[in-house]
């Protein structure tokens, strides 16, 4: 590597590579400064002058140290069935995720492209598998001895209460009715809810610690390559 005191632009020694936050400019054949996240290259470097960077305009961003001529456009505004979990800033793209009660039917690298409402299990059916951020609720018929009298994306089938004397037998959509004032024991003191699916508001307000992903662009090389070998083509 060249000595750390070398200032950009500088010609790298044969076989060496540009330093962190620098790139090799094929035209100038020099190691030049990259622009920091939130900026882009306004003027490319020459043999005598370094890269000139400028801030990204509104609704555009760069997430990486770069030398792109223009910042990337932020994704479109989140739809009504989505919440914005990461705002568009000069350094990161907007991320939209599904709002509570919805799941992602069509995902993209970061966030969701298409949300759909979580299925609600009708009376006589309970939740067999709860909805997640990326999968719908799966319903199942209530087995004998259990019931569900709600239309819900979270309620499971609950056991019928046990009666001393049964007034009305329970079925898949209704609990048993006892003649005595109170059953000998109740196995179903109240509605049983499954945990909320992963896509909940509390988790929207605490996004995971991964930053948004910039589109794959060949000119976003994190480190400058070595000067090209004889006969190879430039970027």
């Amino acid at each position: 590597l060249p000595a750390q005191v070398a200032f950009t632009p500088y010609a790298p020694e044969p076989g060496s590579t540009c330093r962190l936050r620098e790139y090799y400019d094929q035209t100038a054949q020099m190691c030049c400064s990259k622009c920091s996240p939130g900026q882009h290259a306004k003027v490319f470097c020459t043999k005598t002058s370094d890269t000139v960077c400028d801030s990204c305009e509104d609704s555009t961003y760069t997430q990486l140290w770069n030398w792109v001529p223009e910042c990337l456009s932020c994704g479109s505004r989140c739809s009504s069935d989505q919440v914005e979990t990461q705002a568009c800033t000069r350094e990161q793209n907007r991320i939209c995720t599904c709002r509570p009660g919805w799941y992602c039917a069509l995902s993209k690298q970061e966030g969701c492209r298409l949300c759909a409402p979580l299925r609600k299990c009708r009376p006589g059916f309970g939740v067999a598998r709860p909805g997640t951020e990326t999968s719908d609720v799966v319903c199942k018929p209530c087995a004998p001895g259990t019931f569900s009298n709600t239309t819900s994306s979270t309620d499971i089938c609950r056991p019928h209460q046990i009666c001393n004397v049964v007034a009305i037998p329970g079925n898949a959509s209704m609990d048993a009715v006892c003649t005595s004032t109170s059953p000998t024991r109740s196995m179903a003191p109240g509605a049983v809810h499954l945990p909320q699916p992963v896509s909940t508001r509390s988790q929207h307000t605490q996004p995971t610690p991964e930053p948004s992903t910039a589109p794959s662009t060949s000119f976003l090389l994190p480190m400058g390559p070595s000067p090209p070998a004889e006969g190879s083509t430039g970027d």
Epitope: L1, Q4, T17, C18, R19, L20, R21, K34, P37, Q63, L64, W65, N66, Q109, E110, P209, E210, P211, T213, A214, P215, S216, T217, S218, L220, L221, P222, M223, G224, P225, S226
Partner: antibody, heavy 119, light 107 residues
Framework: QVQLLESGGGLVQPGGSLRLSCAAS????????MSWVRQAPGKGLEWVSI????????FYADSVKGRFTISRDNSKNTLYLQMNSLRAEDTAVYYC????????????WGQGTLVTVSS | DIQMTQSPSSLSASVGDRVTITCQAS??????LNWYQQKPGKAPKLLIY???TLQTGVPSRFSGSGSGTDFTFTISSLQPEDIATYYC?????????FGQGTKVEIK
């Protein structure tokens, strides 16, 4: 979400070779520089190597230079570390990590794979 | 190579205490300093980059400051889940180097 999954670790004799892999998902792999960091049992973190997003720039720690080779296959979303002439002091958990801003700040890590060099 | 010296190597504090860890670089690294948390048996987690920028999703009780050669990492109110080893790392130049780590325990 970002996921990195290392594999290929195991027991190898001194002087032997091993190739580690890191399968990436949940992000545009070809946009990010990737790195290997290791941790000897009961010790601190030691950076091993880094590779640019396109794979055409690589850097190594002096302790592994000439013995280890970092590479990547962007079509398979996979990072590799070829380790030759292994020594007892290479025994460690090896982590692959994503460089989040192309400035050597590692924002996502795999769970690690243990490499034991012993006779 | 740039050497990173962390202190103390370990500390014990009570829940709610303010905890401070320092990191010194052997040469000027501007603000290219990152802090990681590593819990036993787990991979490290980036908490702070560029000396003072909090990584997305990291609680605000964690903070960092400093530039040049002297840097500080602070937990404003220690929580039981903060039991871990903390590492500083310079990202100014290759080879990338880490501090030796600071183990934080609860009294």
């Amino acid at each position: 979400q970002v996921q990195l999954l290392e594999s290929g670790g195991g027991l190898v004799q001194p002087g032997g070779s091993l190739r580690l892999s890191c399968a990436a998902s949940g992000f545009t792999f070809s946009t990010y520089a990737m790195s290997w960091v290791r941790q000897a049992p009961g010790k601190g973190l030691e950076w091993v190597s880094i590779i640019s997003d396109g794979g055409d720039a690589t850097f190594y720690a002096d302790s592994v230079k000439g013995r280890f080779t970092i590479s990547r296959d962007n079509s398979k979303n996979t990072l590799y570390l070829q380790m030759n002439s292994l020594r007892a002091e290479d025994t460690a958990v090896y982590y692959c990590a994503r460089d989040g801003t192309s400035a050597a700040a590692f924002d996502s890590w795999g769970q690690g794979t243990l490499v034991t060099v012993s006779s | 190579d740039i050497q990173m010296t962390q202190s103390p190597s370990s500390l014990s504090a009570s829940v709610g205490d303010r905890v401070t860890i320092t990191c010194q670089a052997s040469q000027d690294i501007t603000n290219f300093l990152n802090w990681y948390q590593q819990k036993p048996g787990k991979a490290p987690k980036l908490l702070i980059y560029d000396a003072s920028t909090l990584q997305t999703g990291v609680p605000s009780r964690f903070s960092g400051s400093g530039s040049g050669t002297d840097f500080t990492f602070t937990i404003s109110s220690l929580q039981p889940e903060d039991i871990a080893t903390y590492y500083c790392q310079q990202s100014d130049s290759y080879p990338i180097t880490f501090g030796q780590g600071t183990k934080v325990e609860i009294k």
